[in-house]
């Protein structure tokens, strides 16, 4: 290889070892009968060298730096050439660096020909391996503007006081043009301006200078977005941090055409504007940081440009003014990410502040609209707390657990509506009474309704899930000892039609010691499947649960267990089951950690099944599934 650099070209070439690889044989640059690992070539020099291996691209990289001095003479503006030409360089991963130094009062503009640039974040790489790293200068400090790939929206970057542009090309890449030109501009009076041009629908993710490190103190950075007038743009902040300000306030400012309040100032934690028509600017303004504990200001955001949606002009009123302790979140439902462009899906408050998720709280009336091509991409999750602090006031008080109609009228599917039911410890318990009797979901008899109630303990330290219940069964009521959460979870859009079947009343009742009591009134000819809470994880240790099973006068109940043994192994205490006839009080007691489970038994009168757990050894849990079947009495045994 021969590299000759013209005199006065201000070019330096450096060939050096790249990232070390676990290649068995080292490779060297061979020059003047020497094996070296770094070679520097300066302006005016002509160097001949070879490599000691067949694939030097696996070992070495080449850096070509051109210093452009705009301080002492005219600046060579215009299209930037790749010098020396890539065809004259060894086929190594190469980085062309242009270091332009200019006066503070001079603005420099990098103009990128099509394809424009797409900014990438830390840890990301470009599909074709071609990256553009751009940095500026504040006095002697280098500021990283960002790293960019091809095929994006960034068309121009304006800076002042100097710019360093590094173009990294993989050894196999045929590119032989820089793809950008430099122009001079008047002072921009800020760190930089990045212009992002959208031709049609698309998105751009952009970051503050130095991201993920801190944005320079008290600096200003502007993004100018060029958006066709018929499209709408929405801004969402993906990630941000605020520094500790001594003076001034960190903020973002929008210049939105047609707005009467330009510039519109937002805090970084605010919901950002959405549904904007046409071009707009966004500026990030830093503050004077606390010298002792500065913290860092950083921002990563996304601009989504898409056609206005039909829904974007409809306003929905969500009236939560009469609600208490309730929050409603509209958010994207989890989906597999596709690689192609997907239009954004936003929910907007007052038609302006749009984001991919929105939480509405009780006590207010909210006006929302949607900027979304397909509302099935969103769902709603609601949480409401009903708590009793004074047991004398609450006792026997009832509340209806019903989804408010305002929420049902929204064009977004309800996913979960959770009621957190809180009672004073050891003073009150709860009873859930459904409008329609409930069926417990089991593998043997799964629920096939459009919604279910998920009942679980709401005590943080307690891992107790009573089960999933849907309308159309035999469970008349569920009594629970203490705090629980009841979640209405929908499984199909048809919930809107079946909404009338929902309805659960909770009442505060005198305290009882058992963890839960299920009242079961089986229907004739249907098999009722029941299982212990925390199925698959095992009934928590020392927990007791009961089933109160009603048997009509003219029927016989067959109680069947689906295992021969319970499988529980006790570390301490005993696990037992009591089956007690309610009329005679006659009871059978089974040791679950020793005995075999009873064979199918017939009960002519209502009876109790009570299961109490020991402290089991791990992996040997107590899970029981049983069924109750009613059949008509053939002989009157009374």
């Amino acid at each position: 290889f021969e590299i000759a650099l013209p005199r006065e070209s201000n070019i330096t070439v450096l060939i050096k070892l790249g990232t070390p690889t676990l290649l068995a044989k080292p490779c060297y640059i061979v020059i003047s009968k020497r094996h070296i690992t770094m070679l520097s070539i300066k302006s005016g020099e002509r160097i001949v060298f070879t490599f000691s291996c067949q694939s030097p691209e696996n070992h070495f990289v080449i850096e070509i730096q051109k210093n452009i001095d705009c301080m002492s003479g005219p600046c060579p503006f215009g299209e930037v050439q790749l010098q020396p030409s890539t065809s004259l360089l060894p086929t190594l991963n190469r980085t062309f660096i242009w270091d332009v130094k200019a006066h503070k009062s001079i603005g420099l503009e990098l103009q990128f020909s099509i394809p424009r640039l797409r900014q990438i974040g830390p840890g990301e790489s470009c599909p074709d391996g071609v990256t553009h790293s751009i940095s500026g200068r504040i006095d002697a400090t280098v500021v990283r503007i960002g790293t960019f790939c091809s095929n994006g929206t960034v068309s121009r970057i304006k800076m002042q006081e100097g710019v360093k542009m590094a173009l990294h090309l993989p050894w196999f890449h045929p590119r032989n043009v820089s793809g950008f030109s430099i122009a001079n501009r008047s002072s921009i009076k800020r760190l930089c301006i990045i212009e992002s041009v959208f031709e049609g629908e698309g998105s751009a993710t952009l970051m503050s200078a130095n991201y993920p490190e801190g944005f320079p103190e008290d600096e200003l950075m502007t993004w100018q977005f060029v958006v066709p007038a018929h499209l709408r743009a929405s801004v969402s902040f993906l990630n941000f941090n605020l520094s500790n300000c001594e003076r001034k306030e960190e903020r973002v400012e929008y210049y939105i055409p047609g707005s009467t309040t330009n510039p519109e100032v937002f805090k970084l934690e605010d919901k950002q504007p959405g549904n904007m028509a046409g071009n707009f600017n966004l500026s990030l303004q830093g503050c004077d940081q606390d010298a002792q504990s500065p913290g860092i200001l950083r921002l990563q955001f996304q601009v989504l440009v898409q056609h206005p949606q039909n829904e974007s002009n409809k306003i929905y009123v969500v009236d939560l003014s009469n609600e208490r302790a309730m929050s409603l979140t509209i958010e994207p439902r989890p989906v597999k990410q596709s690689r192609k462009f997907v239009p954004g899906c936003f929910v907007c408050l007052e038609s302006r502040t749009c984001s991919s998720n929105l939480t509405l709280t009780s006590g207010s009336k909210h006006k929302i609209s949607f900027l979304c091509d397909d509302l099935t991409r969103l769902w709603m999750n609601v949480e409401k707390t009903i708590s009793c602090t004074d047991h004398r006031y609450c006792q026997r008080k009832s509340y209806s657990l019903q989804v408010p109609s305002d929420i049902l009228h929204l064009p977004v599917e309800l996913h979960d509506f959770s009621w957190k039911l809180l009672v004073p410890k050891d003073r009150l318990s709860l009873v859930l009474v459904p409008a329609q009797k409930l069926q417990q979901h089991t593998h043997e008899k799964p629920c096939n309704t459009s919604f279910s109630y998920l009942v679980a303990s709401a005590i943080p330290s307690q891992d107790l899930y009573f089960g999933s219940f849907c309308p159309g069964g035999s469970i008349k009521q569920i009594q629970v000892k203490q705090n629980i959460s009841v979640t209405l979870r929908t499984f199909a859009p048809s919930f809107q039609q079946e909404a009338s079947r929902q309805g659960l009343t909770v009442s505060f009742i005198p305290y009882f010691k058992e963890e839960g009591v299920f009242t079961v009134t089986p229907d004739t000819k249907s098999k009722v499947y029941l299982r212990t809470p925390n199925w698959d994880r095992g009934l928590p240790s020392l927990t007791s649960v009961s089933w109160n099973i009603s048997v009509p006068r003219d029927q016989v109940a067959c109680l069947t267990f689906f295992k021969e043994r319970s499988g529980v192994v006790c570390q301490t205490g005993r696990a037992f089951m009591i089956i007690q006839e309610q009329r005679t009080r006659a009871e059978e007691i089974f040791s679950l950690d020793e005995d075999v489970l009873p064979k199918p038994s017939f009960h002519h009168h209502s009876f109790w099944v009570n299961i109490s757990n020991c402290s089991p050894t791990s992996g040997k849990q107590l899970d029981l599934l049983f069924s109750v079947t009613l059949t008509p009495r053939t002989v009157d045994l009374t």
Epitope: V30, S40, I41, R46, I47, V48, F51
Partner: antibody
């Protein structure tokens, strides 16, 4: 134009240290691949390579004389030096410096005119 | 050390004749990069040596094309197709593939 000029003491006595200087112009010893060699030639005899110094200060010596030789350079003043300690009459010779560079055929393409050194008591 | 042997101490030739000077190395002088660093120098009386051929067969700039070099591994030859008066002097082969770099003893080209 490339030019090399050797200079030395002319005459010196046995056991003394011989100091030679090669002053050059037309190239820079900071250029990668560039180097300067010292070669000597006793009168009426053949050539003997002594030492070589590279742009990055790496040095090569003839093992038969290594313990007595020291080659060095001053890049900024375009000079290369050779010191030979404990000289005796066998060191009487014409001493040449020559440049070698990677862009210059990796051979000694330019030589100085030589400086004659006589060791005699 | 690699010994470079020039068998003929002198080679008498007539002007206009072809001259062939041989040089043998005591071992292979191919460098690790596959290049053989074998050079030929001519020293005229009272002058410093001048480079004629580098890397076995490449003529240095300004050297007339009547000079050619050949050979490989351990055997090398310098040919002068038509000897001219200005070609007279001592020819040295030189290897710089392995340290110490070594010169041959020289072959004096003289008029018959």
């Amino acid at each position: 134009e490339v030019k090399l000029v050797e200079s030395g003491p002319g005459i010196l006595q046995p056991s003394q240290t011989l100091s030679l200087t090669c002053s050059f112009s037309g190239f820079s010893l900071s250029t990668s691949g560039m180097g300067v060699s010292w070669i000597r030639q006793p009168s009426g005899k053949g050539l003997e390579w002594l030492a070589h110094i590279y742009w990055d200060d790496e040095k090569r010596y003839n093992p038969s004389l290594k313990s007595r030789l020291t080659i060095s350079k001053d890049t900024s003043s375009n000079q290369v030096f050779l010191k030979i300690t404990s000289v005796d009459t066998a060191d009487t010779a014409t001493y040449y410096c020559a440049r070698e560079g990677s862009a210059n055929w990796e051979a000694m393409d330019y030589w100085g005119q030589g400086t004659t050194v006589t060791v005699s008591s | 050390d690699i010994v470079m042997t020039q068998a003929a101490l002198s080679l008498p030739v007539s002007l206009g004749d072809q001259a062939s000077i041989s040089c043998r190395s005591s071992q292979n002088i191919v460098y690790t990069n596959g290049i053989t660093y074998l050079e030929w120098y001519l020293q005229k009386p009272g002058q410093s040596p001048k480079l004629l051929i580098y890397k076995v067969s490449n003529r240095f700039s300004g050297v007339p094309d009547r000079f050619s070099g050949s050979g490989s591994a351990t055997d090398f030859t310098l040919k002068i197709s038509r000897v001219e008066a200005e070609d007279l002097g001592v020819y040295y082969c030189f290897q710089s593939s392995h340290v110490p770099w070594t010169f041959g003893g020289g072959t004096k080209l003289e008029i018959k």
